[in-house]
């Protein structure tokens, strides 16, 4: 699996999507699960609905949402007020049973928000064509990891 | 209407190898899990393994890991179970199966195909 | 694997009467995905129970499913010719998708 990187500004909601097969999961509870090291467990981080029949209903476990569109197959998760805390590496799953498949490996990073003055070296300033007008805008970038990137800080 | 039909019953020394065929008809071939089944000469149901045709992802059973390979072609709505080097004991019936859906979910196996018979003896 | 057990392994009944056949999960069967099947002799498998239980498209109501968790229960409330024959259960949560060893029905 590549990894996709979603960036999202400090104190902002950040909404990460999962694309997938909606036929092949059908009848499928998905989880967004928080990757603990490179090589380590992926820890639930929250699931949709136990029943499937309602994974439209977006489930909250503290600041992270989970929502499922089964028939377009698109799973939804939003990390509402961004702290620095948050970036790291996670993954959309689709569960069977005491298995789970994954949908899509994420890197969330986290911007500093350019209107924060409280830490002026971390400012990073949006490109011409996105607006901060709307404090309240979800707002994300995702990009794919190119070949040979690491998604985690090397350990010495 | 939905259907499954498989390749006829075969007659093989031990050491052969052999492709058995179970072809879809009546629904979208490739949005729908495909699995086989074997049943022994008066035995139940063993699972197999299934595979996914619209992108061939394949779960085995791990008691036939390695003795069996389920591949599909998208092309002829087909499924194929084969064997390298057959046995003595994969002498059974072998049933291939398609996974239902519900509104509120999986639902199950339906239809199934009548079965191929292999026979394997020297 | 989840492993299935089936019981009783044969039950002997006769036209009329309601028969009771159990199958337990060494574990949780989550989302209560477990069917029921029925085989007779030379015939292949045909679904009856599907979600532990939904009737499948075109089975009688005389057949029906119960339970949740690790029991569950496959109900035929009175006993027709037609009906003597192989049941098996089967998860399908957790690949591999195990079936139970089965219970014969057969006439008293």
């Known amino acids: 699996h590549n990894t996709t990187v979603f960036q999202g500004v400090a104190g902002q909601s950040l909404q990460v999507s999962c694309p997938y097969d909606s036929m092949k999961h059908w009848g499928r509870r998905k989880a967004w699960c928080r990757q603990l090291g490179e090589k380590g467990p992926c820890q639930r981080v929250v699931s949709t609905h136990n029943l499937w029949l309602l994974s439209f209903l977006r489930r909250w476990n503290g600041s992270t949402a989970i929502t499922d569109d089964t028939l377009g197959g698109t799973l939804t998760i939003t990390l509402r007020n961004l702290q620095p805390h948050d970036a790291g590496l996670y993954q959309c799953q689709s569960l069977h049973g005491s298995e789970a498949d994954t949908l899509r490996k994420v890197l969330v990073e986290v911007l500093a928000d350019p209107l924060d003055h409280r830490d002026a070296g971390d400012l990073w300033f949006p490109g011409e064509s996105e607006s901060f007008e709307d404090a309240h805008v979800e707002h994300s970038i995702s990009r794919s990891l190119l070949e040979g990137e690491i998604p985690f800080p090397p350990t010495s | 209407e939905v259907q499954l039909v498989q390749s006829g019953a075969e007659v093989k020394k031990p050491g052969e190898s052999l492709k058995i065929s179970c072809k879809g008809s009546?629904?979208?071939?490739?949005?729908?899990?495909i699995g086989w089944v074997r049943q022994m000469p008066g035995k139940g149901l063993e699972w197999m393994g299934i595979i996914y045709p619209g992108d061939s992802d394949t779960r085995y059973s791990p008691s036939f890991q390695g003795q069996v390979t389920i591949s599909v072609d998208k092309s002829s709505s087909t499924a194929y179970l084969q064997w390298s080097s057959l046995k003595a004991s994969d002498t059974a019936i072998y049933y291939c199966?398609?996974?239902?859906?519900?509104?509120?979910?999986?639902?199950?196996?339906?239809?199934w195909g009548q079965g191929t018979l292999v026979t394997v003896s020297s | 694997e989840i492993v299935l057990t089936q019981s009783p392994g044969t039950l002997s009944l006769s036209p009329g009467e309601r028969a009771t056949l159990s199958c337990r999960a060494s574990q949780s069967v989550s989302s209560s995905y477990l069917a029921w099947y029925q085989q007779k002799p030379g015939q292949a498998p045909r679904l009856l129970i599907y979600g532990a239980s939904s009737r499948a498209t075109g089975i009688p109501d005389r057949f029906s499913g119960s339970g949740s968790g690790t029991d569950f229960t496959l109900t035929i409330s009175r006993l027709e010719p037609e009906d003597f024959a192989l049941y098996y259960c089967q998860q399908y949560d957790t690949s591999p998708f195990t079936f139970g060893p089965g219970t014969k029905v057969d006439i008293k």
């Open positions: 199966t398609r996974q239902a859906i519900a509104v509120t979910g999986l639902g199950g196996f339906d239809p």
């Open positions: 009546g629904y979208t071939f490739t949005s729908y899990w």
